[in-house]
Structure formats: C-alpha cells, structure tokens
Interface confidence: low
C-alpha cells in the first residue's frame, strides 16, 4: 500500500476513534472531531513507510466528561497480529497511569493467547479490540443503523416499572453486536433504539445486552 493510501486510512480510523470516544462521553475537542486529512498530515506526517507517523504515535488518551479521572487509552500496535507481549506492555502502562480501560486497534487480529489475556484481565482492566477495517467507516453514521442510546440504571428502573416488566422480559441484543461494541455497552445494560417511523414519527424499542 502506498503512503497516500495508508495516510488516508490512518486518518479515517483515527477520526472514527475520536467520534467513538466522544459518543462514549469522553472529552474530545471539536477540532479533533473535524480534523481534515491535511490537518492530520500536518500533525502526524504523510510518510508512514518512513515512520511518520508510526502507529504508536496515534495513541490517544481521553478523559470522561463526567469524571476527568476516568480515562481511556486507545492503542495502535505496530505488529499486524498482536501477541501477549504487547498486551502486557499496555497493561503495565495502564497500571503506571492508573487507567483501567483501553481500546486496541489491530491491523489483522490477535493471537489466541492475547485474546485470552483480555478475558483474564477483566474486570480489573477492560481492553477492547477493534479491527482497523471496522473503523474505516463509522457504523453509527450508516443510514440503516438507528440511533442507540445507553440507558442509565434509573431510566431502566423507571422503564420496567412503567411497563410492569422484569429485566429478563426485554428483547435481547448481543454484546458482540457492532453497535454495542462501538458504544462499549456491557452485558446487563439496556439500550434504547430509536427508529424513524412513518406513522408515529419515531418508534422506540428497548434491548437488554447479553
């Protein structure tokens, strides 16, 4: 792949990551969300083949809007298939900085042992894996994907009381659903899905993440 194409891909991936962080409630400046390809080149370089940028230079650290001490890393490993050694380096970094959540943007995937280590480290350290291919577009901006809103505990309690339901009576959505992964929705949370409706203006459904 030539430098121009790779620079474009890195810009698109980083842009989606910034939108994802913003949509999860982390503080991302408007100029980061709006960053043009030219601005990306000015900030990072346009010669990935010569290490400008290296993928590790795209590392992101964001703080949550509600609690600035709640921070999240986004790592961009150099190696195409990420091994357990890299995961250990990231965990050490997280430990040093007292950060418990991170996203890892991988080029081709992870080794089975690296994947298993993510499971083993939860819930102390939450590391989520994204394939860079999935981040070339922002799935939530696709016209066929309805708006998803993660509900607070209070909102779920009110919803269940209003409809005289138990939580397990709600329809399900898989934790591995692409939109659920985008928002980082955990098992047991409830998501409100808002679709446009010709008759009712909008049609709302509720789903329990499993």
């Amino acid at each position: 792949m030539d430098d121009e194409e790779e620079t474009y891909r890195l810009w698109k991936i980083r842009k989606t990551i910034m939108q994802l962080c913003h949509d999860r409630g982390y503080l991302v400046t408007q100029d980061e969300l709006d960053q043009t390809l030219e601005e990306f080149k000015a900030q990072f370089g346009d010669k990935p083949s010569e290490g400008r940028p290296r993928r590790t230079d795209l590392t992101v650290l964001v703080a949550h809007n509600d609690d600035p001490t709640d921070q999240m890393f986004v790592f961009f490993p150099e190696e195409p298939k990420v091994g357990i050694k890299t995961i250990k380096v990231y965990c050490q970094r997280m430990q040093e900085e007292n950060i418990t959540r991170a996203l890892i943007v991988v080029q081709q995937g992870m080794t089975p042992s690296a994947k298993q280590s993510l499971v083993d480290m939860a819930p102390k350290y939450i590391l989520e894996q994204f394939l860079q291919q999935e981040l070339l577009i922002n799935i939530t901006e696709h016209e066929l994907v309805p708006e998803h809103v993660v509900m607070t505990k209070e909102e779920v309690t009110e919803l269940l009381a209003r409809y005289k339901l138990r939580e397990n009576q709600l329809p399900r959505i898989q934790a591995g659903d692409p939109v659920a992964r985008y928002f980082g929705i955990k098992r047991g949370q409830v998501v409100k899905i808002i679709r446009p409706s010709e008759t009712a203006g909008r049609y709302i459904t509720y789903r329990l993440v499993q």
Epitope: E39, G51, P53, R54, R55, T56, D57, V60, L61, E97
Partner: antibody, heavy 125, light 102 residues
Framework: EVQLLESGGGLVQPGGSLRLSCVAS????????MAWVRQAPGQGLTWICF???????HYAESVKGRFTCSRDNSNNTLYLHMSGLRGADTAKYYC???????????????????WGQGALVIVSS | DIQMTQSPSSLSASVGDRVTFTCRAS??????LAWYQLKPGKAPQLLIY???SLETGVPSRFSGSGSGTDFTLAISSLQPEDFATYYC?????????FGQGS
C-alpha cells in the same frame, strides 16, 4: 516534582559534533513526546525537533540532516546529536515536556509546561 | 510552514497598567496557540495554552483570547515581576513555530 536536566553543552569548532542529553524525572517519560528548543543570543525561541512517544521524529528545516533527536525510555533520557555545527547554531538549548501525554497524537497539542535550565552550545574557532 | 507574527515588538508600561500583546498566524490554527514568558537566565514559562486556558499556577491577571489567525495575551494589572519577553507558539502542526517575541 517534574525535573529536566540538560548536559553536554560546551565550545565546539565549526563542522564539529556534540551530543546533548536531557534526563527527565517526576513523570512517566515514555508516555510523553519531547522536544528541543533553542535560543540564540539576543534572538527568540526556535523549535528544533520533537520525538513522539512512539519514536516518530519531526525536525525544523534548518537542522534536518545535521541533527538527530532520539530517546532512551529505559533511562528517561532525551538526546540531541548535533553534527556539521555552524556559528548560527550557537545558542542555549532547552529540552521541553508537553503538558499532555501522547502529544502530537490523540486529542492533544504541543504546549510545553516544563523546560530544563538549558545547555549552552558555542560554535567558534 | 505557519508563520507567527507578534506585535508590538516592545512596549513601555508601568506597574498597574493593562497590557495587551497580539499574535497573528499566517493560516487558520483554530485555537492551537500558547503564550510563554521568558526572563533572562531563566527557562521559558507556559502561561496560556489552547489560546485561552490558564496554565496551573499562573496568576489570573494573565488571560488569552482569539481563534483562527488572531490572538491576544492580556495582563490586567502589570506587576513588577511581569516585565519580561512574551512569545506565542502555534501547536497546530509540525514544524512548531514561535513568534519573534514582544
């Protein structure tokens, strides 16, 4: 407490070489990009180079090909290797730390909140 | 490269005066600008970043404003320790550039 301590300055002849070091303490060095900035006598501040947390380097046009910016995270040390020195390179050289980690990346930009006291380099025959 | 132009290059003022410095960028740098204070024999000190954010520990008499290409540093009531040279710096992209100083 954050500290940056430069060393290695001195008198060098035109065309000669010199290596400056900057030892950092009081913060997680590996998480931060680092920069060298200089001030020539009676002049303003001039940015020289930047080494990202992932080792990516950026240089000012005036030093490209002559200066090399590098880092050793295991020793919390930033280096500036200068060769082909000219009279115009005579200056006080500062190492500087950005106020946010992963600067030059992520949501942050390069604003330098901590500076060393500077190392004086004199290029003269 | 982005050129940064400061004005005035120097000014005379007295303790208690309100003082303003301006900095102009050769292209739109949004709010990616910092102001530093430099005194002889001392290391530069960050005063303002992101055009208007006051660095921790910097007195509130210092303030910054502007975005795009035009920026201002203001000192509301000049103190004896404020007599120094002030530099603006763009952080929009590489190469990083400073103004010539005021």
């Amino acid at each position: 407490e954050v500290q940056l301590l430069e060393s290695g300055g001195g008198l060098v002849q035109p065309g000669g070489s010199l290596r400056l070091s900057c030892v950092a303490s009081g913060f997680t060095f590996a998480s931060y990009g680092m920069a060298w900035v200089r001030q020539a006598p009676g002049q303003g501040l001039t940015w020289i180079c930047f080494v990202g947390s992932g080792d990516t380097t950026h240089y000012a046009e005036s030093v490209k090909g002559r200066f090399t910016c590098s880092r050793d995270n295991s020793n919390n040390t930033l280096y500036l290797h200068m060769s082909g020195l000219r009279g115009a390179d005579t200056a006080k050289y500062y190492c500087a730390k950005p106020n946010s980690p992963f600067t030059g990346s992520g949501s942050f930009h390069n604003y330098f909140d901590y500076w060393g006291q500077g190392a004086l380099v004199i290029v003269s025959s | 490269d982005i050129q940064m132009t400061q004005s005035p290059s120097s000014l005379s003022a007295s303790v208690g005066d309100r003082v303003t410095f301006t900095c102009r960028a050769s292209q739109n740098i949004r709010n990616n600008l910092a102001w530093y204070q430099l005194k002889p024999g001392k290391a530069p000190q960050l005063l303002i970043y992101s055009a208007s954010s006051l660095e921790t520990g910097v007195p509130s008499r210092f303030s910054g404003s502007g975005s795009g290409t035009d920026f201002t540093l203001a000192i509301s009531s000049l103190q004896p320790e404020d007599f120094a040279t002030y530099y603006c710096q763009q952080a929009h992209g590489f190469p990083i550039t400073f103004g010539q100083g005021s």
